[in-house]
Amino acid sequence: NKILVKQSPMLVAYDNAVNLSCKYSYNLFSREFRASLHKGLDSAVEVCVVYGNYSQQLQVYSKTGFNCDGKLGNESVTFYLQNLYVNQTDIYFCKIEVMYPPPYLDNEKSNGTIIHVKGKHLCPSPLFPGPSKP
């Protein structure tokens, strides 16, 4: 028996920040679980981990240097990411593991979310255009 995960197909990270909601076909209330976000088609980079233990305070960390936070809903975990790099534009996959109570459960691989990180571009104001090129 696998948990199903729904994610937005695409998100745009303005100001190098984004919120990605992972919606599960499972109620996480009063469960011990490990929700994680993975980067890349092969999910090779574990971006962020949110560890929940019976509705107590979530423990959040990243072993790969990402600035992240997490929020728990009954059937969702939202990952908040800050300070993303433009070159971190990629596909991101939600993963969930329920450790307790038994049986251990995890998810079917989701379709993922493409996060497009927009760079900060300083555009010239139309009132003060840059020098014209001959």
Partner: antibody, heavy 120, light 107 residues
Framework: EVQLVESGGGLVQPGGSLRLSCAAS????????MHWVRQAPGKGLVWVSR????????SHADSVKGRFTISRDNAKNTLYLQVNGLRAEDTAVYYC?????????????WGQGTLVTVSS | EIVLTQSPATLSLSPGERATLSCRAS??????LAWYQQKPGQAPRLLIY???NRATGIPARFSGSGSGTDFTLTISSLEPEDFAVYYC?????????FGQGTKVEIK
């Protein structure tokens, strides 16, 4: 005026516990992330723990994970750090610091610190 | 974890002189770098954030520059109250880290 006042430090034996407190005033405490940063005698600053604005999530440095617990009471405008399993290397001044929720790790105001000494 | 290396460890100058402090990151932190001042027995105070923005109430003699891996804090003309230890700190990557500090002392 923003004020952060730490308390609860003291002399404790290795393996012992303490609960540090940080009383906040002069700003809307419940809107800010809060942090603990420590400084061993004569050394530099080291980030320890953080908690988000509503207290629902936390992160800890690897060196204290499983031993230290950060919490907050927004009704009392107070931040806490429960420190267990203390070691000699935990001897430091512990500062609480405020961070804006839009810049999680920009520490714009700091308390005066409370000294924790771990010694037998 | 990103390592920040500050130089020099100690800077001996006279009031009125210009102080130039350096902070080098082990990898790019873009412009997510702050500078703090700490006087003996006191808490750190935020001076500069995001490499070049002065915090509230910080005098104009303090300025920051740089991006990527190399950053500079400049005090244009040292006042007696500026003699202290200065730390840089990055928030680009988790966990946040600090440099080991530069002490600016009276010559």
């Amino acid at each position: 005026e923003v004020q952060l006042v730490e308390s609860g430090g003291g002399l404790v034996q290795p393996g012992g516990s303490l609960r540090l407190s940080c009383a906040a005033s002069g700003f809307t405490f419940s809107s800010y992330w809060m942090h603990w940063v420590r400084q061993a005698p004569g050394k530099g600053l080291v980030w320890v723990s953080r908690i988000n604005s509503d207290g629902s999530s936390a992160s800890h440095a690897d060196s204290v994970k499983g031993r230290f617990t950060i919490s907050r009471d927004n009704a009392k405008n107070t931040l806490y750090l429960q420190v267990n399993g203390l070691r000699a290397e935990d001897t430091a001044v512990y500062y609480c610091a405020r961070a804006d929720s839009s810049s999680w790790y920009k520490f714009d105001y700091w308390g005066q610190g409370t000294l924790v000494t771990v010694s037998s | 974890e990103i390592v920040l290396t500050q130089s020099p460890a100690t800077l001996s100058l006279s009031p009125g002189e210009r102080a130039t402090l350096s902070c080098r990151a082990s990898q790019s932190v873009r412009s997510y770098l702050a500078w703090y001042q700490q006087k003996p027995g006191q808490a750190p105070r935020l001076l500069i954030y995001d490499a070049s923005n002065r915090a509230t109430g910080i005098p104009a003699r303090f300025s920051g520059s740089g991006s990527g891996t190399d950053f500079t804090l400049t005090i244009s003309s040292l006042e007696p109250e500026d003699f202290a230890v200065y730390y840089c700190q990055q928030r680009s990557n988790w966990p946040p880290t600090f440099g080991q500090g530069t002490k600016v002392e009276i010559k």
